[in-house]
């Protein structure tokens, strides 16, 4: 007789997700020298163990702990780069600025980029046929909880100018409730953050506008300056040329505003 | 801006003890959780463990609890770690920093603890 088993709003556990995990573990520790004493079995072991034979509908912070403590690692807490809904481009700009880190960019970040998972109370199995979806089902299932908490403490761990990088070609370019909006920017530590920098990226080629004076930017200005946290903001007309000036500011190209 | 200097590292034999401070400025220190957190020799950041701004939650890496103690004195801005049992593979550079990870960056120089015989 097959098991009854709950059919979840969401996809399904990404295939070959514990496979996934560890060849990432593996070659985040090859590129990263001083990530090289990370046990990826004992990460994985970790992972495992924060959403296996639990409710997905019922996972904790504290769940994800013993993770926590094997991704250990030094980042510069001034080098920070947060972003919302335009993911690509912040990520092409730190692989292109090595000394900035987007969360990705961490071993956490790294393992869970892109992928789903979730298991079922009682059984050592992992869902690959459907996983909660955090507004049709629950909202503390293991991907929104570990995202939660590991964006949670990146944002705790910034210091002086944090930079965000925002979609300027959404309705909402500051949402409220997006992780940069509901959980990064209060838990930016206004006695360590100084400025709380905004990039708004355009997508339109002859847009000239100043999005810097969009509704949701001001909102944000407003959040931030009630944490006694200084605000600026950018436009980046141009984010192809912006890349291109990220890798040669000496272009005579790049003087002017892009 | 979030200062931190650690003292009371040094040559240790194999059993006994040494008594990790760490004194802060530059932040309320009672806001702050703080943790302590090590580098042995080509080796990579290891975190040790972490105490809340009250005090009321303390957390150890699974190879020193028993061993050490963390502790702070809010009315002093400064955090403790007490080493007892010391084995040769605690020998690290051990840093004081804000927060309780995964992500460091810690501000002080450090201290040095060497377990020899």
């Known amino acids: 007789v097959p098991r009854w088993r709950q059919q979840w709003s969401g996809p399904g556990t990404t295939k070959r997700f514990p496979e996934t995990v560890l060849a990432r573990c593996v070659k985040y520790t090859e590129i990263h020298p001083e990530m090289r004493h990370v046990d990826c079995q004992s990460v994985w072991d970790a992972f495992k163990g924060a959403f296996i034979s639990k409710h997905p509908c019922n996972i904790t912070e504290e769940d994800y702990q013993p993770l926590m403590k094997l991704g250990t690692q030094t980042v510069p807490c001034n080098k920070i780069l947060l972003w919302s809904r335009i993911k690509d481009l912040a990520h092409q700009f730190t692989q292109v600025q090595r000394d900035m880190f987007t969360l990705e960019d961490t071993l956490l970040g790294y393992l869970a980029d892109d992928l789903t998972w979730c298991g079922e109370f009682n059984t050592s199995k992992i869902n690959y046929q459907s996983c909660p979806d955090w507004r049709k089902d629950c909202s503390n299932n293991p991907v929104s909880v570990f995202w939660k908490t590991v964006s949670r403490r990146f944002a705790e761990a910034a210091c002086d100018v944090v930079h965000v990088m925002l979609n300027g070609s959404r309705s909402k370019i500051f949402d409220k409730n997006s992780t940069f909006g509901s959980v990064e920017v209060h838990n930016l530590q206004p006695e360590k953050v100084q400025t709380l920098e905004a990039w708004v990226i355009h997508g339109g080629r002859e847009d000239s506008r100043d999005l810097c004076q969009d509704p949701t930017i001001k909102e944000l200005e407003s959040i931030i300056s009630k944490r006694n946290i200084q605000f600026s903001c950018k436009n980046i007309y141009r984010p192809d040329k912006f890349l291109q000036c990220v890798k040669n500011p000496e272009d005579s190209s790049c003087t002017s505003e892009i | 801006e979030v200062q931190v200097l650690e003292s009371g590292g040094g040559l240790v034999q194999p059993g006994g003890s040494l008594r990790l401070s760490c004194a802060a400025a530059?932040?309320?220190?009672?806001?702050?959780?703080m943790s302590w957190v090590r580098q042995a020799p080509g080796k990579g950041l290891e975190w040790v463990s972490s105490i809340s701004g009250s005090a009321g939650t303390i957390d150890y890496a699974d190879s020193v609890k028993g061993r050490f103690t963390i502790s702070r004195d809010n009315s002093k801005n400064t955090l403790y770690l007490q080493m007892n049992s010391l084995r040769a593979e605690d020998t690290a550079v051990y840093y004081c920093a804000d927060g309780t990870g995964p992500f460091f960056d810690y501000r002080g120089q450090g201290t040095l603890v060497t377990v020899s015989s």
């Open positions: 530059g932040f309320t220190f009672s806001n702050f959780a």
